[in-house]
C-alpha cells in the first residue's frame, strides 16, 4: 500500500556507542522524504528529523531520557512535493525498526588508559572514565555512573620481553597488580558488561608500554 512512487524504508538499523544513538535506513530517497518517530512501550510517539532527505536520524536526545526503556522507531515515507499525501489506507507508508534497549545494547566505546604508576612491585593502571550523553541533574554521566558495577574492565598485561599474557579484572576504573621490579610491561584494557547477551565487550584499548618515551607516569 502507499502513495504511488513512494517506497517504505527498509534495513532500519540502530548504531549506538556509549549511548550516542543513530537510526539508519535505506533507500536513499528519490522524490520522497522521511520523518522518524520514536517511542517507548507507552506508545507516546515523538517525531524527529522532519521531512528529511537523510537516511539517518540522531535519536540520542530521546533514548538518554531513560536508557533502560525499550524503544521502537518508525520511519514514514512521504512524496517529496506533497507531504500531506497519504496511502490508500489514509496513512503514510512506514516501517518499524527492531526494538532497542540502550542499557543492554549500546556498544561500549574503546577504553583509554589514563595513567599508570609503578611503585616497587606494584603497578597501578587507571582507565579513563568515558563520558556519555546521559544526563542527571544537568550533568553528563560517565559510563561508570550509568552502569555501576555492571561494568567491569579486564586488563591484559605482559612483560615487554615475553608474550605470555596475564589478566586482571576490576569493577572500578583502577587496577593494582603485582609486577616484577625492574621489568617493563605492556598492557591494554577492555570494557566488559558480563550480564549482557549482546555487545558484551568493547574493543581493546591501544596498547601502552612502560619505559617508552612517555615515561612511567602518564596523564
Amino acid at each position: 500500500s502507499g502513495t504511488t512512487n513512494t517506497v517504505a524504508a527498509y534495513n532500519l538499523t540502530w548504531k549506538s556507542t556509549n549511548f550516542k544513538t543513530i537510526l539508519e535506513w535505506e533507500p536513499k530517497p528519490v522524490n520522497q522524504v522521511y520523518t522518524v518517530q520514536i517511542s517507548t512501550k507507552s506508545g507516546d510517539w515523538k517525531s524527529k528529523c522532519f521531512y528529511t532527505t537523510d537516511t539517518e536520524c540522531d535519536l540520542t536526545d530521546e533514548i538518554v531520557k531513560d536508557v533502560k526503556q525499550t524503544y521502537l522507531a518508525r520511519v514514514f515515507s512521504y512524496p517529496a512535493g506533497n507531504v500531506e499525501s497519504t496511502g490508500s489506507a489514509g496513512e503514510p507508508l512506514y516501517e518499524n525498526s527492531p526494538e532497542f534497549t540502550p542499557y543492554l545494547e549500546t556498544n561500549i566505546g574503546q577504553p583509554v588508559i589514563q595513567k599508570y604508576e609503578q611503585g616497587g612491585t606494584k603497578l597501578k593502571v587507571t582507565v579513563k572514565d568515558s563520558f556519555t550523553l546521559v544526563r542527571r541533574n544537568n550533568t553528563f554521566l560517565s559510563l561508570r555512573d550509568v552502569f555501576g558495577k555492571d561494568l567491569i574492565y579486564t586488563l591484559y598485561y605482559w612483560k615487554s620481553s615475553s608474550s605470555g599474557k596475564k589478566t586482571a579484572k576490576t569493577n572500578t576504573n583502577e587496577f593494582l597488580i603485582d609486577v616484577d621490579k625492574g621489568e617493563n610491561y605492556c598492557f591494554s584494557v577492555q570494557a566488559v558488561i558480563p550480564s549482557r547477551t549482546v555487545n558484551r565487550k568493547s574493543t581493546d584499548s591501544p596498547v601502552e608500554c612502560m619505559g617508552q618515551e612517555k615515561g612511567e607516569f602518564r596523564e
Epitope: S1, G2, A8, S39, T40, K41, S42, G43, D44, W45, Q69, L72, S88, A89, G90, E91, E95, N96
Partner: antibody, heavy 118, light 107 residues
Framework: EVQLLESGGGLVQPGGSLRLSCAAS????????MSWVRQAPGKGLEWVSS????????YYTDSVKGRFTISRDNSKNTLYLQMNSLRAEDTAVYYC???????????WGQGTLVTVSS | DIQMTQSPPSLSASAGDRVTITCRAS??????LAWYQQKPEKAPKSLIY???SLQSGVPSRFSGSGSGTDFTLTISSLQPEDFATYYC?????????FGQGTKLEIK
C-alpha cells in the same frame, strides 16, 4: 506477574451508560499503552480503543466514536472505558489488555460482561 | 479499514500433527501482525508479534512467518492443550482488525 482485572460490567438498558475499570499490577503502568477489546457472544475479537501511556493519545473503532471514552489514571494504575448511548450490539465481554507501543496485546484481563437489553 | 481473512475457519487434527493457519490482509501491513490463542470461556493469550517474534513463555513449537499480505502460524507438533481458536490481528493502522478466527479441533 502482570495482572489485569476488569470490573464494572453488567446489565444496562439501551441508551444507558456504564463505566468499566481495569486495575493493573505487576508492571509499571504508565510505561505501557493500554487497549480495550470486546467479544460478542459466540463471535470473534473486535478492537475497541487504545490509549498511550501518558493518556495524550487515544484511538477508537468507528462504531464507538463519540459514545465511548477511554482514559487512565496512572496514579491509581487503572484504565477506564466510559460507555454512553449503549446499543444492543455493544453486548460483549470486554477485555482490557496491555499494548506495547500501542500495537499488539501481550497481556489480557479475564474480561467483564456487558449486556445491553431492555 | 484493513480486512483480515483467516483460513481455514475450522480445522481437525490429531496430537503430534503439524498444523498451519493462514491469515491474509487486504493490503500490505509489512510485519505488523500478531497471533493469539483463545480457549473456551477464557481470555485470549498472545503467541506471536511482529509476524514472527515469539511472545515470552510461549512454547517453541509455535512459529509465525510472512510479510506484506500473507502470514502463517505453524504449530510443529500439536499438543492436547493446543486445541483452541486462533486469531490474527493487524496493527499497521487504526482501526486495528482481527481475523474471524480458526477453530482447531481434535480429530
Amino acid at each position: 506477574e502482570v495482572q489485569l482485572l476488569e470490573s464494572g460490567g453488567g446489565l444496562v438498558q439501551p441508551g444507558g451508560s456504564l463505566r468499566l475499570s481495569c486495575a493493573a499490577s505487576g508492571f509499571t503502568f504508565s510505561n505501557y499503552a493500554m487497549s480495550w477489546v470486546r467479544q460478542a457472544p459466540g463471535k470473534g475479537l473486535e478492537w475497541v480503543s487504545s490509549i498511550s501511556g501518558s493518556g495524550d493519545y487515544t484511538y477508537y473503532t468507528d462504531s464507538v466514536k463519540g459514545r465511548f471514552t477511554i482514559s487512565r489514571d496512572n496514579s491509581k494504575n487503572t484504565l477506564y472505558l466510559q460507555m454512553n448511548s449503549l446499543r444492543a450490539e455493544d453486548t460483549a465481554v470486554y477485555y482490557c489488555a496491555r499494548s506495547p507501543w500501542g500495537y499488539y496485546l501481550d497481556s489480557w484481563g479475564q474480561g467483564t460482561l456487558v449486556t445491553v437489553s431492555s | 479499514d484493513i480486512q483480515m481473512t483467516q483460513s481455514p475457519p475450522s480445522l481437525s487434527a490429531s496430537a503430534g500433527d503439524r498444523v498451519t493457519i493462514t491469515c491474509r490482509a487486504s493490503q500490505g501491513i509489512s510485519s505488523r501482525l500478531a497471533w493469539y490463542q483463545q480457549k473456551p470461556e477464557k481470555a485470549p493469550k498472545s503467541l506471536i508479534y511482529a509476524a514472527s517474534s515469539l511472545q515470552s513463555g510461549v512454547p517453541s513449537r509455535f512459529s509465525g512467518s510472512g510479510s506484506g499480505t500473507d502470514f502463517t502460524l505453524t504449530i510443529s507438533s500439536l499438543q492436547p492443550e493446543d486445541f483452541a481458536t486462533y486469531y490474527c490481528q493487524q496493527y499497521n493502522s487504526y482501526p486495528y482488525t482481527f481475523g474471524q478466527g480458526t477453530k482447531l479441533e481434535i480429530k
